[in-house]
Amino acid sequence: MMTGTIETTGNISAEKGGSIILQCHLSSTTAQVTQVNWEQQDQLLAICNADLGWHISPSFKDRVAPGPGLGLTLQSLTVNDTGEYFCIYHTYPDGTYTGRIFLEVLESSVAEHGARFQIP
């Protein structure tokens, strides 16, 4: 039975040209995390695998940095980066847990972090 929950940074906003850290945390399970996939809509951004380490999409090689931890740092943000991001935790023996983050990239300097929320 899948008992874990994923806590994410929730709905967040950031300034155009700036950077943002996307973070997810898996808790309430003893399952082993074998791989975390980061996706934007249907596009794979990066993979962090327990054996193979980090691998970043060539399409984002200059704007995505691994970490901190299992998180992902997006740099040189543009308005086109606005949208949904997903952290997909592949675990053994539980299976797959998915967290959702919504990022809004703002033209102005009024960029505030939203509240954290949990996805069971």
């Epitope: 794979l44 054996d51 193979l52 999409s57 060539p58 797959t96």
Partner: antibody, heavy 120, light 107 residues
């Protein structure tokens, strides 16, 4: 036209090492991951690992960890796969294969293959 | 590791036949599945990626479908040049893994 041209067939003794090359042309070499896949005679396909010429980042199938090394020479657009401590079961055709543009973990172009025979 | 179980391992068919090959993943791989065609002594060639996207230059008689754990490659009307071995591959989780292959032979 994208081309991946591999080095010629090799015959090696058990315990020896082999280094296979794969020269890429027809595209921007540092924009795509390169993978190595092998196929034993009459058998299926087995993924060995990947290397990213942009930053030399590698990842190896745990089955080969400690025995395989993948390297890059960007000046000649060539990737290399070296396999150590050869045994008879390493007899196979070794292919380099380029990672796809939308996801780097499927293979859109393949080299012609290099037969490595391990025999005493 | 994710096991990709292909069936059948071989089949005999005639030119013009509709051929279906299935691939079952041991866990959910969403739609991260590719299909390849390999002829004797040659490297594999990409046919389908993302479970259902036909690769550039691949004839429309080849189609892929499925998501989750069950995937299908269909050849709507088998042509003489289609006699070959077909492999599925998952690319959701490392290590990347292939099915055992399906050899399509002439009846």
């Amino acid at each position: 036209e994208v081309q991946l041209v591999q080095s010629g067939a090799e015959v090696k003794k058990p315990g020896a090492s082999v280094k296979v090359s794969c020269k890429a042309s027809g595209y921007t070499f540092t924009d795509y991951y390169m993978h190595w896949v092998r196929q034993a005679p009459g058998q299926g396909l087995e993924w060995m690992g990947l290397v990213y010429p942009y930053n030399d980042n590698t990842g190896y199938n745990r089955k080969f960890k400690g025995r395989v090394t993948m390297t890059v020479d960007t000046s000649t657009s060539t990737v290399y796969m070296e396999l150590n401590s050869l045994r008879s079961e390493d007899t196979a055709v070794y292919y380099c294969a380029r990672g796809g543009p939308s996801n780097w973990n499927y293979f859109d172009y393949w080299g012609q293959g290099t037969l490595v025979t391990v025999s005493s | 590791d994710i096991q990709m179980t292909q069936s059948p391992s071989s089949l005999s068919a005639s030119v013009g036949d509709r051929v279906t090959i299935t691939c079952k993943a041991s866990q959910n791989v969403v739609t991260a599945v590719a299909w390849y065609q390999q002829k004797p002594g040659k490297a594999p060639k990409l046919l389908i990626y993302s479970a259902s996207n036909r690769y550039t230059g691949v004839p429309s008689r080849f189609s892929g479908s499925g998501s989750g754990t069950d995937f299908t490659l269909t050849i709507s009307s088998l042509q003489p040049e289609d006699f070959a071995t077909y492999y599925c591959q998952q690319y959701t989780l490392y290590p990347l893994t292939f099915g055992g292959g399906t050899k399509v032979e002439i009846k």
